[in-house]
């Protein structure tokens, strides 16, 4: 009997109102044995995956994913999903990426370091669970 | 299908250098940690060192056996996989295998390649 | 560094035993252990990861249990290309060290 996979969760370090050049890394978790991560931009058309996985704990594994300089079109709405055989995982929440101009004062709206960034998490649409993982052969226009 | 070539073992004198390559194809390697194990005639396996993708800015791992004097390194233009091999011992005598990192897990290895550090 | 004990270092069994060989880590590592088969001349092989997960193309005669620090590899019927070497490994923290590996002979 295939096991229940537990949804992803992500987070952006160091927050998520990230200043324009600055960089961003998404952090996507889940189960040990994952397989392949992949961090989806607003809809599954535009997409990042990795085999990259370490432990986050005795019971999780995480994939990292780093925008070196982001950019006014790195803004938008982001979520996780993962490839565990036989089978991939709901998506996760939303997180939505801000890109601002430049540093701003005390009352920048800036996330705590280390956030999943609270409010500016969305609820995931699940109603699709049909992806192949892009390294055996299915590609996407990357996130960067 | 999944291939990983070692090449550049050989023979070696006590604190001479050897460079090993390997190979990768039939997978997306620049997604993919990278290792090298290696197991010395009628021994077991030794984890050698290991290299992260670009999301975790290439970190490098090693054994304390070969820190310092090991330098494990990749070209993602080229596929490709080098362990630099300095100051070699003769207990550094052994097959070294290119093995790829998949879930945290050694799912792929190459046939290996000999070392051989002998005066 | 996370040890890892295995037990027994070589058995002698027959075609259609059942065989159980055993990992023990030195600290909890939860699930983070592989099981490789290796044998003569030949590069290892992933049989389990996470503990429990069987790799791809891997017959289901071969089966992986425990977490924390208790593990066990079972082959439910052996069979006479299972003869070979396996080894444990943890991958929860570098070192990423290896079991002394086990071999399983003809009886």
């Known amino acids: 009997q295939e096991e229940d996979l537990p949804r992803p969760s992500i987070s952006a370090e160091p927050g998520t109102v990230i200043p324009l050049g600055s960089h961003v890394t998404f952090v996507c978790r889940g189960p040990v044995g994952v397989q392949t991560f992949r961090l989806e931009r607003d809809s599954r058309s535009t997409y990042n995956d990795t085999e990259d996985v370490s432990q986050a704990s005795p019971s999780e594994s995480e994939a990292r994913f780093r925008i070196d300089s982001v950019r006014e079109g790195n803004a938008g709405l982001y979520r996780c999903i993962y490839y565990k055989p036989p089978k991939w995982s709901e998506q996760s929440d939303y997180l939505e990426l801000l890109v601002k101009e430049s540093s701003g004062g005390p009352d920048s709206p800036d996330t705590e370091p280390g956030s999943s960034a609270g409010p500016t998490q969305r609820p995931s649409d699940n109603s699709h669970n049909e992806h192949a993982p892009a390294s055996q052969g299915l590609k996407a226009e990357h996130l960067y | 299908e999944v291939q990983l070539v070692e090449s550049g073992g050989g023979l070696v004198q006590p604190g001479g250098s050897l460079r090993l390559s390997c190979a990768a194809s039939?997978?997306?390697?620049?997604?993919?940690?990278m290792n090298w194990v290696r197991q010395a005639p009628g021994k077991g396996l030794e984890w050698v060192a290991r290299?992260?993708?670009?999301?975790?800015?290439?970190?490098?791992f090693y054994a304390d056996s070969v820190k310092d004097r090991f330098t494990i390194s990749r070209d993602d233009s080229k596929n490709s996989l080098y362990l630099q091999m300095n100051s070699l011992k003769t207990e550094d005598t052994a097959v070294y295998y290119c093995?790829?990192?998949?879930?945290?897990?050694?799912?792929?290895w190459g046939q290996g390649t000999t070392v051989t550090v002998s005066s | 560094d996370i040890q890892m004990t295995q037990s027994p270092s070589s058995l002698s069994a027959s075609v259609g035993d059942r065989v159980t060989i055993t990992c023990l880590a030195s600290?909890?590592?939860?699930?983070?252990l592989g099981w490789y088969q290796q044998k003569p001349g030949k590069a290892p092989k992933l049989l389990i990861y996470?503990?429990?997960s069987l790799a791809e193309g891997v017959p289901s005669r071969f089966s992986g249990s425990g977490s924390g620090t208790d593990f066990t590899l079972t082959i439910s019927s052996l069979q006479p290309e299972d003869f070979a070497t396996y080894y444990c490994?943890?991958?929860?923290?570098?070192?990423?060290?290896f079991g002394g590996g086990t071999k399983v002979e003809i009886k």
């Open positions: 039939g997978f997306t390697f620049n997604i993919n940690a």
């Open positions: 093995v790829r990192d998949r879930a945290g897990f050694f799912a792929y």
């Open positions: 600290q909890t590592i939860g699930t983070w």
């Open positions: 490994q943890q991958l929860y923290s570098t070192p990423l060290t």
């Open positions: 290299i992260r993708t670009k999301n975790y800015n290439y970190a490098t």
């Open positions: 996470a503990a429990t």
